[in-house]
């Protein structure tokens, strides 16, 4: 099919670059003839260092090709992304980042974990890819619910907490108010809506401290709020239904033995919060002496019968409703309770299956007489709000 054009010279035979091939292969290439270069799998077309998706050259009248020959260069995925709170190891060889090289991501042991196995391979598209086909690096998620606390300790009727007992405990300080919260991720705090309602439009004025036992300790980790999310069903000053809020922190905090999120309840957790099951609440609120606690105090308290609690409060404060979004805890005989200044703190339970602590309740409201007989503490029932919590966290 070759037609030698007048006054035109044939072009030099194109030589396929290493790891590449040329098509079509012809005995001679003359004016307007063309060839394309294709690279083997794991190699890419580069013109200098610039990637090309395809390459076709055309023979010109003067007997030269209109484009310089590219190369087929081995795919290089480049240095893998850094992993916050983790590290990457080169498996194939030191700093080897080319096609089929393998790397292994790992999280800092004890305090962080990843959902995948962390193994990534440099694939032909030039991206580090996991066995599940993920192109983004894994995430080191904070471990939740690890504590040195054990149930059985005999706030009001409480005992001082030891280091590592309640690493999720957060102190919320306003100009004139103090409340608590629970770390549920490395940049999210769960608390009671009523405790932060006044700050909702001025989040930055809320001072958040964590990693402390002594309320006035100078050795705290400071966190600043970015935004406060009050549950849309909460009406300030009209009862305590939906008394739940989330605080997004400006920065992620580093997780360690004294700062760690509490777990959120699994679906199966409802069975661990039945009447008479024991939970633990900690706080710097009023103690039996009527003074704010200097040291973080905790108390182990049983879940109260919901109907009995509802009846008590109907009698005590007519018009104040104990809703299905609340759970009550305390002894019929009194003596163990949370109190003013504990608001927003977590009522936690040990999940026997996972051996992790999860938040079942948020300190919400109760009788003016903390720890009085037959007058239970009322807590926001967190399990009812898991979809709300997950929705806020995933969207913001």
């Amino acid at each position: 099919h070759h037609h030698h054009h007048h006054a035109s010279r044939p072009c030099p035979d194109p030589t396929a670059p290493p790891n590449g091939s040329i098509s079509p292969v012809q005995a001679i290439y003359v004016l307007k003839d063309r060839f394309s270069v294709f690279c083997k799998t794991g190699f890419e077309l580069l013109q200098g260092s610039v990637p090309l998706k395809s390459f076709t050259a055309v023979c010109q009248k003067d007997g030269s090709w209109d484009r310089p020959m590219p190369e087929c260069s081995i795919i290089d995925c480049g240095p893998p992304d850094d992993l916050p709170n983790g590290h990457v190891d080169y498996i194939t060889g030191p700093e080897v980042t080319t096609y089929k090289a393998v790397i292994q991501y790992s999280c800092e042991e004890t305090f962080y974990t990843m959902s995948s196995n962390g193994k990534y391979v440099c694939e032909a598209d030039g991206f580090w890819t996991s066995s599940k086909g993920e192109k983004l690096p894994p995430v080191c998620e904070p471990v939740c619910g690890l504590s040195t606390h054990t149930i059985g300790g005999r706030i009001v009727g409480g005992q001082p907490a030891k280091p590592g007992d309640f690493p999720w405990q957060v102190l919320l300080l306003g100009q004139t108010t103090a409340a608590a919260g629970a770390l549920i991720h490395d940049n999210w705090v769960l608390t009671a809506a009523h405790a932060v309602y006044e700050k909702r439009m001025a989040a930055s004025s809320l001072n958040i401290r964590m990693g402390i036992l002594k309320r006035l300790s100078p050795h705290y980790t400071q966190a600043w709020p970015e935004e406060i999310f009050i549950h849309e069903g909460y009406t300030h000053g009209a009862g305590f239904d939906n008394d739940i809020a989330l605080i997004k922190l400006k920065n992620k905090v580093t997780i360690n033995g004294s700062i760690m999120p509490v777990c959120l309840p699994r679906k199966e957790a409802a069975s661990l919060m039945r009447t008479d099951f024991t939970g633990t609440v900690a706080g710097w609120g009023l103690t039996q002496k009527g003074l704010l606690a200097r040291n973080l105090m905790f108390v182990d308290i049983p879940i109260a019968d919901h109907q009995k609690c509802t009846a008590v409060y109907e009698k005590l404060y007519p018009g104040v409703r104990v809703s299905a979004n609340m759970l009550c805890a305390g002894l019929e005989t009194g003596g163990k309770d949370s109190c003013r200044g504990d608001a927003g703190g977590a009522l936690v339970f040990l999940d026997n299956e996972t051996q992790r602590w999860f938040v079942g309740g948020i300190v919400s409201w109760g009788s003016i007489n903390c720890g009085a007989a037959d007058q239970y503490g009322v807590y926001t029932k967190v399990i009812n709000y898991i979809p709300w919590i997950e929705n806020i966290i995933s969207n913001f």
Partner: antibody
């Protein structure tokens, strides 16, 4: 014919991030080639900053690696430059460009970015 | 980094003259694939640079044939056979063989 147009704020405060967009018309940024950012300092010195390829892979000028990110939005046929922790030394005219068998065959008209308190 | 040194920094010419700009690189620009990625760009005041020549001697589309490029290894030249008014501006050589790629400081072509 392919056309490129830079856009973004003309004034950035020191220590903040500089963010620019390059809108491409007449050619899809996923079809082929590499898409570059280049800057020209007062005094006319030119510096290549980095590129994003048709496949989305990036290559940066080593001194800028810790501060630069080039990303894209294929649905809008745009690619972006983000330069963090800027100083007055980052004051320049920023250009986007496209390569072929050469590095910069097609250029945008450039946008001046001043870094000043 | 490869240093690109242009001479002269300023080149006064008369219209119709031949102009020659030299560019020297601090190391060979022959790429491992055998090509030499040396390019020339021209910039007029208030405009973006425009590509004139690539891989030493190939003219970019639409570039008049009065522009020619030559050289090898570390020494390269851009010639304009007959300077026209529209050719006045700043000329930059550029190397794309070694990353990071680098530009020369520029040569200003101006009227005598």
């Amino acid at each position: 014919e392919v056309q490129l147009q830079e856009s973004g704020p003309g004034l950035v405060k020191p220590s903040q991030s500089l963010s620019l967009a390059c809108t491409v018309t007449g050619y899809s940024i996923t079809s082929d080639y590499a898409w570059h950012w280049i800057r020209q300092f007062p005094g006319n010195k030119l510096e290549w900053m980095g590129f994003i390829s048709y496949s989305g892979r990036t290559n940066y000028n080593p001194p800028l690696t810790s501060r630069i990110s080039i990303t894209r939005d294929t649905s809008k046929n745009q690619f972006f430059l983000q330069l963090n922790s800027v100083t007055t030394e980052d004051t320049a005219t920023y250009y986007c460009a496209r390569s072929y068998d050469y590095w910069f065959g097609y250029w945008g008209q450039g946008t001046l970015v001043t870094v000043s308190a | 980094n490869v240093l690109m040194t242009q001479t002269p920094l300023s080149l006064p010419v008369s219209l119709g003259d031949q102009a020659s700009i030299s560019c020297r690189s601090s190391q060979s620009l022959v790429h491992s694939n055998g090509n030499t990625y040396l390019e020339w760009y021209m910039q007029k005041p208030g405009q973006s640079p425009k590509l004139l020549i690539y891989t030493v001697s190939r003219r970019f589309s639409g570039v008049p044939d009065r522009f020619s490029g030559s050289g090898s290894g570390t020494d390269f030249t851009l010639k304009i056979s007959r300077v026209e008014a529209e050719d006045l501006g700043v000329y930059y050589c550029f190397q794309g063989s070694h990353v990071p790629v680098t530009f020369g400081a520029g040569t200003k072509l101006e009227l005598k």
